[in-house]
């Protein structure tokens, strides 16, 4: 039975050119995390893998940083980069579990971060 | 250049333990993550299980209970035991290097495969 | 474990005409997938990882592309040494998986 919930950043917003970490954490679980996904859509930005450390994506190299910890940091964002991300846990032997981001990028300096909320 | 070369007996009795080496020659094992996949006749190419650049392993959990990998980095090789085995482990066996990093799951440098009947 | 099932099972092209290879995974896989050629004899070589980024020397007539479920190899100008079984892979999650291979020969 998967008893795990996944807290994340929520809906959060930034500035074009700016930075931004997407972070999740999942609690509530003792199952063992193999390995975290980070998505866009269905684009892969990065693989945290438990035994072999980071994957990022060709392309998304060079403006996408791992960590903190298990979050990401990405960089030099454009007002394409507005949209839902995923962070996909691996787990044994509960499973997968998922946590939605949303992230808008603004024009302007009136960028301030959303409130966190859980996913079950 | 980067070779990798696997040996081992080409003929295993069923119930014995299956064992080959992968021998690993113009790099250094103490990077990248080392890979065993095996293909029985006929069949897809299955993923057997690895070994990381800092000795932790994975296996494939429909062989886990009958599979170890190993290395011996002074010799610059790793090694698969199979035990318990049977007709159905008839395959040929290859090893295979990963960078997880610039890669991910993708295998770049593979040895030329040896194969291995059970067979009493 | 992930499923992947590749169409068609065997493709036999004039030298010179394109040819296309579906791989379709039994979940969303992202962009983590790659391709293999397994020529007569020898062991997989690396074509495509990352869906559609060619590996190092591999020759611009070989291109990847799709996300999520579906994906597809193109050769844009078969050559006769592109004969051989082409396999798609997916690395999303452990354990990774192979497709069953398409065979592919020269007419």
């Known amino acids: 039975m998967m008893t795990g919930t996944i807290e994340t950043t929520g809906n959060i917003s930034a500035e074009k050119g700016g930075s931004i970490i997407l972070q999740c954490h999942l609690s509530s679980t003792t199952a063992q995390v193999t390995q975290v996904n980070w998505e866009q859509q269905d684009q892969l930005l990065a693989i945290c893998n438990a035994d072999l450390g980071w994957h990022i994506s060709p392309s998304f190299k060079d403006r996408v940083a791992p960590g903190p910890g298990l979050g990401l940091t990405l960089q030099s964002l454009t007002v394409n980069d507005t949209g839902e991300y995923f962070c996909i846990y691996h787990t044994y032997p509960d499973g997968t579990y998922t946590g939605r981001i949303f992230l808008e990028v603004l024009e302007s300096s009136v960028a301030e971060h959303g409130a966190r909320f859980q996913i079950p | 250049e980067v070779q990798l070369q696997e040996s081992g007996p080409g003929l295993v009795k069923p119930s014995e333990t299956l064992s080959l080496t992968c021998a690993v020659s113009?790099?250094?094992?103490?990077?990248?993550?080392w890979n065993w996949i095996r293909q029985p006749p006929g069949k897809k190419l299955e993923y057997i299980g690895y070994?990381?650049?800092?000795?932790?392993?994975y296996y494939n959990p429909s062989l886990k209970s009958r599979v170890t990998i190993s290395r011996d980095t002074s010799k610059n090789q790793f090694s698969l035991k199979l035990s318990s085995v049977t007709a159905a482990d008839t395959a040929v066996y290859y090893c295979?290097?990963?960078?997880?990093?610039?890669?991910?799951?993708?295998?770049?440098?593979w040895g030329q495969g040896t194969t291995v009947t059970v067979s009493s | 474990d992930i499923v992947m099932t590749q169409t068609p099972l065997s493709l036999s092209v004039t030298p010179g005409q394109p040819a296309s290879i579906s791989c379709r995974a039994s979940?969303?896989?992202?962009?983590?997938i790659a391709w293999y050629l397994q020529k007569p004899g020898q062991s997989p070589q690396l074509l495509i990882y990352?869906?559609?980024y060619r590996y190092t020397g591999v020759p611009d007539r070989f291109s990847g592309s799709g996300s999520g479920t579906d994906f597809t190899l193109k050769i844009s100008r078969v050559e006769a040494e592109d004969v051989g079984v082409y396999y798609c892979?997916?690395?999303?999650?452990?354990?990774?998986?192979f497709g069953g291979g398409t065979k592919v020969e020269i007419k």
């Open positions: 990352s869906a559609s």
């Open positions: 295979a290097r990963g960078d997880y990093s610039n890669y991910g799951g993708a295998m770049y440098d």
């Open positions: 070994i990381s650049y800092s000795g932790r392993t």
């Open positions: 979940q969303g896989v992202s962009t983590t």
């Open positions: 892979q997916q690395y999303y999650s452990s354990p990774f998986t």
């Open positions: 113009g790099y250094s094992m103490t990077s990248d993550y």
